[in-house]
Interface confidence: low
Amino acid sequence: EVEKTACPSGKKAREIDESLIFYKKWELEACVDAALLATQMDRVNAIPFTYEQLDVLKHKLDELYPQGYPESVIQHLGYLFLKMSPEDIRKWNVTSLETLKALLEVNKGHEMSPQVATLIDRFVKGRGQLDKDTLDTLTAFYPGYLCSLSPEELSSVPPSSIWAVRPQDLDTCDPRQLDVLYPKARLAFQNMNGSEYFVKIQSFLGGAPTEDLKALSQQNVSMDLATFMKLRTDAVLPLTVAEVQKLLGPHVEGLKAEERHRPVRDWILRQRQDDLDTLGLGLQG
């Protein structure tokens, strides 16, 4: 806590400018009016304050807004955001995507901090669902964001938002998450033609059931082995040799290299040897 001291004569801040970097902590506390700071928060980021000085500025804002900062201040916090605790952020009501972007920009290049996680949680809860623009923004800053959500949280993602998802956004998703995302992706891409549909749905196929894989096998999609290896084992097991051959197209030869790994290993064990032999790959059931 900064000790309350009178502001020296002639040092009362008329505006937030670079002269303040020469103020000691106690002078900032005594000479900078909190209301002035709040109205000129956009200037703070342009001034190379030390972290100690930023602590003083945060303290002044906390006193002015004990119930939580208004969005007009939050949007211009800049580096001061890094000083906020999750408890501070829980008091906020952030509704503007521009505010969210501004604060994520401050943390750019770093792992998702507890502060950022709390901010995102507040923002998404305020909106009621993960709309497309929000998802677009979050995955741009944190490609793994989608896979950090629980299946229950993912249930609030509307199918229209799935258009914002890039393949790399799903890299760390587990089967339970893809179980939720796949049907949404199917709905989102339902009006696309066969080849375009496959390009879009491919990243989500780790949540696809057997019947959809069978349907895809009828559409000359030529699934690559990397995608095939991410399919649910229980979805792959009922596929016939002919269906897998159609599904993979020219990539079927890659099964040999993966014969010891799931789901290929388990699938091979379910097939008749005569059927496997038709592939001419030397696969042994």
């Epitope: 709905l187 339902q190 959809d212």
Partner: antibody
Amino acid sequence: EVQLLESGGGLVQPGGSLRLSCAASGLTFRSYAMTWVRQAPGKGLEWVSGISVSGGITYYADVVKGRFTISRDNSKNTLYLQMNSLRAEDTAVYYCAKRGAAVGSFDYWGQGTLVTVSS
Amino acid sequence: DIQMTQSPSSLSASVGDRVTITCRSSQGIGSWLAWYQQKPEKAPQSLIYAASSLQSGVPSRFSGSGSGTDFTLTISNLQPEDFATYYCQQYNSYPLTFGGGTKVEIK
């Protein structure tokens, strides 16, 4: 062989409640999304509700939303349908069916259980 | 909601006939259509999924075709056990919806 066996149907008064169960065998229950479909006497098929593999996602027809609750217990290989505030128009044979996804066709069906709502 | 309209609602045919049932959706559903057979007092049975894929164990005299909004179920050589009611169902989007059914009766 996949088998789905419904139970819990019966006669109930309007406004009453019933809980239907569907015991599954011959399949890895936890790997499949499930659904309830009903058929009023002499009428066609009507989809009622669906549930995802984990049970985390549920879907309902508008006519039952807020009154019916679908759930599952993967440890017991059982699907449930809790039906509250029953109406005469809910009278039907209720079938549970196995699906491969949260949206999909139904490849195995139970034999059905009759629910009669009447005073 | 997507409406599914089946025609005819009933038809009479003889053993050995070729029977065609049509199903039309109120909006495009790609190939996400299934066909079911139901006999009196029995549960429905899956015949076709993905518009044209035959369910395991279903005789090859049953076939499905179509995509978008217009679909057809064909029974090429009607057998005594095929007299039943047939339903189409879309699984393109929620709520999942069925056609009104087509009853195939003995002439």
